[in-house]
Each structure stands twice: as C-alpha cells, then as structure tokens.
C-alpha cells in the first residue's frame, strides 16, 4: 500500500532541562516525513510538528501543562509527498517513546550564582532562581516555585589562597556562611533533588570569587 520505502522512527529520546523538553529520534529522513503525537496516560493524543523533516520536536508547551503527569509520545512516518498513505495494517508506521515524567526526570540546568555579599565574617550567597516555562495563573514559575523544598543547593566554597573546600546546603536559594575576615573566597553551587533516583544533580555552576564584580563588601 505504498509505504515500502518508509521506515519507522527509532531511538526515541527525551531531552529535557528545567522542563524545556524536546523529543529526538532517528533516522534522518529520506523520502519521508514525521508527525509527533503526545498524550498523558489517560488523555487524548495531540499532534505536533506536522509532516516535518526534522528529527526533533519541541514538546515543552504540552508537558508544562502538568509536569507531574507521565507522558508518552509517538512518531509517525509518512512517505514524502503522500502523507495520506498508510501501512499494510491501514495506518502509518509509528514508534512509541519511553514514558516521561517531567517532575521526576527533567535535568537540572547548570545553576548560576546571582550575587554574594560579605558583612563582617558572614557571606550571603544567592543562587539565581531560574525561570522555567511552567506557568501558573499566566505567570512563568521559577525552578523553586515548581520544586519547592524538594530542591536543594549544595555550596562549595574555599579560600582563594588554598585548595581545601567546605560545603553547605540550603533548601532556599540563599546561603549564609562564616568566613575568615580579610580572606577572599570562591564559590560554586550545585542543584540536587534528593528524592530522585535519576537526574538527581546538576553540573556545578561557574565559579565566582570575591574581589570580582558580583560581590559586595560591607564592614
């Protein structure tokens, strides 16, 4: 029935960071196009990326509707120029993705140290609360808004003059740490979701050191 040169998509893979979520697959199309459908376990299928020659589809708009739901996607293959054509069973070839639960699986993006302020022997280090594409009441939520106390940050800090590191944790976006007066310190943070079993930790933030622009010093 005209689909002999159409191949099913394979290696369907979710790529997701801070809820920005793209489905990728293979192969690069030769004389065929793809359409993607996504649904929750109990929901209806919604079509996206119609008749595309791309091998990726941005599904962020769909998954941010409820990041705690589990989603399934499927990729349909059609002959180029004959998208009405169906397979031998009367429907186009398709392949299912693995299930994907954004809240449990989206990668934590590399955090950024927003600022640090020294007052005497205390330093307040603030982690930028990154905006996500998850919405509530028409406003975009931050990572902290979405994860709440499930998200913690680990701070690594050390004297610029030595290699010995210290660490502290917070389930807000701020650290208040003790430092030695007159010493410059460097800082790096990592996001962690302790309750997860996969994609638990982010990469470390870029290192920021006292004596550079982000900091402030007060007696």
């Amino acid at each position: 029935s005209g689909t002999t040169n159409t191949v099913a998509a394979y290696n369907l893979t979710w790529k997701s960071t801070n809820f920005k979520t793209i489905l990728e697959w293979e192969p690069k199309p030769v004389n065929q196009v793809y359409t993607v459908q996504i649904s929750t376990k109990s929901g209806d299928w919604k079509s996206k990326c119609f008749y595309t020659t791309d091998t990726e589809c941005d599904l962020t708009d769909e998954i941010v509707k409820d990041v705690k739901q589990t989603y399934l996607a499927r990729v349909f293959s059609y002959p180029a120029g004959n998208v009405e054509s169906t397979g031998s069973a009367g429907e186009p070839l398709y392949e299912n993705s693995p299930e994907f639960t954004p809240y449990l699986e989206t990668n934590l993006g590399q955090p950024t140290i927003q600022s640090f302020e020294q007052v005497g022997t205390k330093v307040n280090v603030t982690v930028e609360d990154e905006r996500t594409l998850v919405r509530r009441n028409n406003t975009f939520l931050s990572l902290r808004d979405v994860f709440g106390k499930d998200l913690i940050y680990t701070l690594y800090y050390w004297k610029s003059s030595s290699s010995g590191k210290k660490t502290a944790k917070t389930n807000t976006n701020e650290f208040l740490i003790d430092v030695d007066k007159g010493e410059n310190y460097c800082f790096s943070v990592q996001a962690v979701i302790p309750s997860r079993t996969v994609n638990r930790k982010s990469t470390d933030s870029p290192v920021e050191c006292m004596g550079q622009e982000k900091g402030e010093f007060r007696e």
Epitope: T167, N171, P194, S195
Partner: antibody, heavy 117, light 107 residues
Framework: EVQLVESGGGLVQPGGSLRLSCAAS????????MHWVRQAPGKGLEWVGW????????IYDPKFQDRFTISADTSKNTAYLQMNSLRAEDTAVYYC??????????WGQGTLVTVSS | DIQMTQSPSSLSASVGDRVTITCKAS??????LSWYQQKPGKAPKLLIY???GEPEGVPSRFSGSGSGTDFTLTISSLQPEDFATYYC?????????FGQGTKVEIK
C-alpha cells in the same frame, strides 16, 4: 539491590599507608555523594569526608585534610580512601556511605584498620 | 564547626517504655539533621531524616521533631530489637558532625 562493600583494611605500622575501597552496586555512584565515616573501638561515629564522584569535588574534616585523600573511579563504580602517615589513633572500623544530599541511606559493612607496631 | 551535643549518653528502659533522645546543635542547622541506629558489630542504619522524615521500612514508633538547634528522637513504645546505640548527624555544613551517641540498654 543497593550494596556497598568496603575492602583494604588490615594491620599497618605507624607511619604506613593504606588504601580502602568501597565498591558500589545497584546504583551509579556519580548520581550521589559518597562519604567515609570511621568508628574507633568502643567509640562514636566520626565523619571523615565526602566526594562527588561526578566532578571529583572533595570535602574533608580539616583534621584529615593533610593525610587522607578521597577519590572515585566511576568506571569501576568505586570510591577510595587513601590514608597516609597512619597513627595508632587511626585504628577504627571505616565505613563508606551513600548520601542522597538529605541523608545517608546506605552504609557498607565496614573494614577494620589497625595501626600498630 | 558545629558541635552536636547528644543526651543522655546512655539510658536504661523497659520494653513498652517511651524513650526520648535529644540533640542540640551549637548553631542553627535548619532541617539538616538525621538519626541513625547502630547495633554492635553492624553498620549504622537510617531512622529519621530532615528531622521528621521516615524512610520506608522504619517502624512508626520512631519519630523525630525539632528545628533550628534542638532536635528529638522519640521511640513511642520500646521493643526488644530497639536496644542499640543512636546517633544524630548534622549535614547542613562541613565538617559534618555526629552526636556522641546514646546507648539504650535493657533495665
């Protein structure tokens, strides 16, 4: 099933060195922090230090910083504790533990290190 | 460094008794406190985390409370298998520190 198995303990002379291993199975160590904790005979628990195996970041109790080194080999799913310039007071059972960042949920059975001439 | 002062260092109790162990931090550790049980010759076992969280498999007679600097582990009705040594651990900042331990013995 998550398991941690320490090895490498034994009798060593004062001033000597020893490398302890903590072989993990049932999970990937790079997804967690790994700690070493020790317990001298009849005494309480004492934290030695941690490693984030994914990036190699290490943190020590300052009293161990100069003599002990924690490392990890993610390809072997194993964490290590290298102990140098050992003293009689380092005699203890050494445990490795997995840290979720909220708690130490799995511990090894421990390996005994005896420092004596 | 944060010091953890655990008390009592030992106590004698009977099966069915309510037992309370306290840990006091030398400064605010927020919620970064967990409790461990250790039996002779065995590795410590997690009992309570984030002051109040209970891992799967831990009997409901174990509970935690407190915040900031003062924390409590309560065993509501002591069972024969609960005779052991209990430790608190602060892991909010390095160096992480354990309490000195509380040995719960049979009266």
């Amino acid at each position: 099933e998550v398991q941690l198995v320490e090895s490498g303990g034994g009798l060593v002379q004062p001033g000597g060195s020893l490398r302890l291993s903590c072989a993990a199975s049932g999970f990937n160590i790079k997804d967690y922090y790994m700690h070493w904790v020790r317990q001298a005979p009849g005494k309480g628990l004492e934290w030695v230090g941690w490693i984030d195996p994914e990036n190699g970041n290490t943190i020590y109790d300052p009293k161990f910083q100069d003599r002990f080194t924690i490392s990890a080999d993610t390809s072997k799913n194993t964490a290590y504790l290298q102990m140098n310039s050992l003293r009689a007071e380092d005699t203890a059972v050494y445990y490795c533990a997995r840290d979720t960042a909220a708690y130490f949920d799995y511990w090894g059975q421990g390996t005994l290190v005896t420092v004596s001439s | 460094d944060i010091q953890m002062t655990q008390s009592p260092s030992s106590l004698s109790a009977s099966v069915g008794d309510r037992v309370t162990i306290t840990c006091k931090a030398s400064r605010d550790i927020k919620s970064y406190l967990s409790w461990y049980q250790q039996k002779p010759g065995k590795a410590p076992k997690l009992l309570i985390y984030y002051e109040t969280g209970e891992p799967e498999g831990v009997p409901s007679r174990f509970s935690g409370s407190g915040s900031g600097t003062d924390f409590t582990l309560t065993i509501s009705s002591l069972q024969p298998e609960d005779f052991a040594t209990y430790y608190c651990l602060q892991h909010g900042e390095s160096p992480f520190t354990f309490g000195q331990g509380t040995k719960v013995e049979i009266k």
